[in-house]
């Protein structure tokens, strides 16, 4: 059968596998007068790889709480027993009602876009809910992943999420939307409103058209001991235990304290959700208590003292101090005043010293200044806050925050590439390619100290010298070198990175770019001399822009060669001579040339050499440039893209032909060699390159 | 002290219409469903439907659907009945009752309404 | 709709005796939200609006004597009056509030024999 390139380049050809993994199929090549002979192309067949989910895709959150996901929830394999780490899921569709993150990364970033099952595996793949201002009851999340494996087939999966008040929440005793408890001055009465104590969430879950004739029961199963609950002034009593969602929010509800004493007091109730007019409805439930705590009149409420954040490398532990932790309150003891965790970082734990290994949720100052209470920071790098309530048992609780910085164990300066100045400006920005801190992350944050200046710029900063400067002027283009002495073609200069706490110092390499055009062409050929001028070479922007005539000097090089000036004519006195300096205009004027030698010592054959010059032009700094170029032996039938001065000797006498040579100094002809006529792309092209040859 | 008060007793003939009220005093007026409940001379007792003064939300019994007006005036804490298209089956005492939870926990004195040509 | 019977329709029983009145609602008046059953008992005497005696099928209304109680779930409840007084003399009707139309039974006449 025959098949064209087109069809082959179109994708029109398919190959069917049927039978043994291994095999393949014969073919010959024609392009219509000359025909290949016979090649063989392998085909190698895989076993397909089926990647397959399981788990139940649905995830179960706390309100307002932050949820692993597991491998109940999201269990990824394959056919091949893929290592978890190479099965990966891309996030295609996010969560709307939270977010997904990483516990090793930073939790205030960006989105989470792709996760191994291996992550998922170590608890380390997170989905925190972000509590609505609006109540509910039940609310729905989705999640589209897409799970990948090369070569395996791509597999589409949904992970439904069901944030419920229903479930059993370890962090969030309450099923209502508030449960907070109520502060009474003692003998005094205090109003119990939907700041406190609020049941809406249970309303949400009628739909809205038919809320409006919807309430929520409360019912009174213990009485306080020390007061009186009272609905529109009536007390409650045990023949009278009810009260409403609607008089809450109407204000109607009032504890009145009785006085003789500071002790806790509170009730106990079921709430469940009553339809119009009080008819049944099905719906939601809760048994639950309200805390009453009773304040002593002459109470001075405790004062939180400005609070320094702590500092500690990830994996670590370290003590808090009253420098983290204090209050100042007269009346109470230190054992008297409590504090509690309300919201924890994912970056580690508070502990207790002898209360056991677990992290601990309540603790008092006292705990504090004994030096027992201490935080333990797990493997994430990430800063993060405690959010508190303190709380000396006789005042309203008061927020407070630690904040916890994770410190890295090393910083490292990275230098991606020295620092280029343009050579006719003298000066340029710094950037990330020359100066950028990195720990376990991108430290951004980064400051530097210039510990040891350059010897021929300044560092300056809006125009002004500086010795200092940050990470983020270096990323706004605000931080410059400028050379101040026109005399090196390169500086450095050493700095001292700060970040978290850490620092590392790094020297930054300034070179200055040549403002030259170099053109080396296709190879050389050996035993010539060709004309440097500047179709090779050219400094003519330079000399443009400083008004001068720019010059070069030989610093290294040719190995194989040598740069000589070429006589002007035949009459001028002896051969070429060896140059070690020359100007722009001895590159104009056409008066330079350079000996391309063989390689010694080895068989004819391609070979490559280089020049490395200096070139210096007024009120700039020099720089230095190299112009590399490729070499072969001498090949008269070649066209070459450079003017050739002379031609070795051998060829001259093989050829017979003087004009080949133009020992007068008069260039060659000048011949550019032709692109290939190879058809661009495509199997047959592949195929014509690889065979034909 | 949770009052109801009502209406006078009316008579009307067939085809007419009534329109009993009921003042309510001693609580929050729009905190509480009004409901309406009738008895007929020497029968048992029927109900006819509730409001919710809060909302203007009103449920009336299948049987006097079309023909029952429940209203509630928030200014006057007062709660109306309105009955149209009477029949002689309709003479009863009509009672206004509050309800609370899921019970009728105070009912007004009773307001009779007679129907006769 | 749910419909509510009572029986017996009326009933004599001698003071210091025990008197009960049943109910049966046509569905059952249990509550799978709360476990409440929604069924309350009224006293009327005549010439007055009816007194709220029991609610919740169990749950005696403030200021109500003792000797009143209630009992029952789902379908079939009872009314019991532990020792009749003279003042107990009225018509009594159960009444479920479990939704509308919140039905009464056609009432019990309780007299002394």
């Known amino acids: 059968r025959t098949r064209s390139g087109s069809q082959l380049d179109g994708g029109l050809v398919l190959f069917s596998h049927r039978g043994t993994l291994d095999g393949g199929f014969r073919f010959r090549l024609s392009d219509g007068e000359h025909t290949s002979p016979g090649h063989f192309f392998r085909v190698t067949a895989q076993k397909q790889v089926l990647l397959s989910l399981k788990g139940s895709q649905t995830l179960t959150v706390c309100p307002g709480s932050v949820q692993p996901l597991s491998s109940q929830t999201l269990r990824a394999s394959s056919s091949a027993g893929t290592d978890p780490q190479l099965l990966l899921y891309r996030v295609v569709r996010g969560p709307q009602l939270g977010r997904l993150f990483h516990a090793q990364q930073d939790s205030t970033g960006e989105a989470l876009v792709n996760f191994t099952q291996a992550e998922v595996y170590a608890g380390n793949i997170l989905y925190e809910h972000e509590m609505p201002p609006e109540p509910f009851w039940e609310a729905h999340d989705t999640l589209e992943l897409q799970l990948s494996s090369p070569p395996a087939r791509d597999v589409a999966a949904t992970l439904a999420v069901a944030v419920s008040f229903e479930a059993a929440c370890p962090q969030r005793p309450s099923h209502l939307w508030k449960n907070k408890g109520l502060w009474v001055p003692e003998g005094q009465r205090a109003r119990i409103t939907v700041a406190a104590l609020d049941a809406s969430n249970l309303l949400a879950s009628v739909p809205s058209p038919q809320r409006s004739e919807h309430d929520v029961l409360f019912q009174v199963t213990q009485f306080p001991s020390r007061g009186q609950l009272l609905v529109s002034e009536e007390p409650l009593h045990a023949g009278q235990p009810h009260f409403l969602q609607s008089q809450l929010a109407a204000g109607q509800l009032v504890y009145a304290h009785g006085g003789g004493g500071t002790q806790q007091d509170g009730f106990h109730f079921r709430a469940h959700l009553q339809g119009p007019a009080g008819a049944s409805v099905a719906g939601p439930q809760t048994s639950e208590a309200f805390a009453i705590t009773v304040r002593d009149v002459n109470e001075r409420p405790p004062q939180p003292q400005a609070s320094v954040p702590l500092r500690l490398t990830r994996g670590s532990r370290a003590p808090i101090s009253r420098a983290q932790l204090s209050v100042v309150d007269p009346d109470s003891a230190p054992g008297e005043i409590e504090y509690e965790v309300q919201r924890a970082p994912h970056n580690g734990f508070l502990s207790l010293v002898g209360g056991g290994l677990g992290p601990v949720t309540r603790f008092t100052q006292a705990d504090v200044d004994s030096g027992r209470l201490a935080f333990v920071a797990n493997g994430s790098s990430v800063a993060g806050i405690f959010q508190l309530s303190m709380s000396d048992g006789a005042s309203p609780p008061l927020p407070m925050s630690l904040a916890v910085d994770i410190l890295p164990s090393a910083i490292e300066v990275q230098l991606r590439a020295p620092l280029e100045v343009p050579q006719a400006l003298g000066r340029s920005s710094l950037s990330q390619q020359q100066l950028r801190v990195v720990s376990d992350r991108e430290e951004p944050e980064a400051a530097y100290r210039l510990i040891q200046g350059p010897q021929y710029g300044h560092l300056l900063v809006g125009g002004r010298p500086t010795s200092a400067f940050s990470q983020f002027q270096i990323d706004q283009g605000e931080v410059v070198f400028a050379f101040t002495n026109s005399s090196s073609s390169h500086d450095h200069f050493r700095v001292l990175a700060l970040a978290r706490g850490v620092n590392a110092s790094a020297v930054v390499n300034v070179t200055v770019r040549a403002l030259l055009h170099v053109w080396a062409g296709g190879p050389w050929p050996q035993g010539a001399t060709l004309r440097l001028d500047p179709t090779v070479l050219d400094a003519g922007e330079l000399a443009n822009r400083t008004d001068s005539v720019p010059r070069f000097r030989l610093l290294e090089g040719p190995r194989h060669g040598r740069v000589v000036r070429v006589p002007r004519a035949r009459t001028e006195p002896g051969g070429s001579q060896l140059v070690e300096q020359f100007t722009q205009q001895d590159l104009e004027d056409g008066r330079l040339g350079l000996e391309v030698g063989r390689p010694e010592g080895r068989a004819p054959g391609p070979a490559g050499d280089s020049l490395t010059l200096e070139l210096w032009a007024q009120g700039v700094p020099p720089a230095v440039a190299s112009l590399d170029f490729a070499t072969e032996p001498y090949n008269a039938a070649r066209p070459y893209s450079v003017a050739l001065l002379s031609v070795p000797e051998a060829a001259r006498t093989e050829a017979g032909k003087p004009e080949s040579s133009t020992p007068t100094g008069e260039p060659g002809p000048m011949a550019s060699s032709p692109e290939p006529a190879v058809a661009k792309g495509g199997f047959l092209s592949f195929l014509e390159a690889n065979m034909f040859s | 002290q949770v009052q109801l008060v009502q209406s006078g007793a009316e008579v009307k003939k067939p085809g007419a219409s009534v329109k009993v009220s009921c003042k309510a005093s001693g609580y929050p007026f729009t905190g509480y469903y009004m409901h309406w409940v009738r008895q007929a001379p020497g029968q048992g007792l029927e109900w006819m439907g509730w409001i919710n003064p809060n909302s203007g939300g009103t449920n009336y019994a299948q049987k006097f659907q079309g023909r029952v007006t429940i209203t509630a005036d928030e200014s006057t804490s007062t709660a109306y009945m309105e009955l149209s298209r009477l029949r002689s089956d309709d003479t009863a005492v009509y009672y206004c009752?509050?309800?609370?939870?899921?019970?009728?926990?105070?009912w007004g004195q009773g307001t009779l309404v007679t129907v006769s040509s | 709709d749910i419909v509510m019977t009572q029986s017996p329709d009326s009933l004599a029983v001698s003071l210091g005796e025990r008197a009960t009145i049943n109910c049966k609602s046509s569905q059952s008046v249990l509550s799978s939200s709360n476990n409440k059953n929604y069924l309350n008992w009224y006293q009327q005497k005549p010439g007055q609006p009816p007194k709220l005696l029991i609610y919740w099928a169990s749950t005696r209304e403030s200021g109500v004597p003792d000797r009143f109680s209630g009992s029952g779930s789902g379908t079939d409840f009872t009314l019991t009056i532990s020792s009749l007084q003279a003042e107990d003399v009225a018509v009594y009707y159960c009444q479920q509030h479990f939704n509308t139309p919140f039905a009464f039974g056609q009432g019990t006449k309780l007299e002394i024999k």
């Open positions: 009752a509050k309800s609370w939870v899921s019970w009728f926990a105070s």
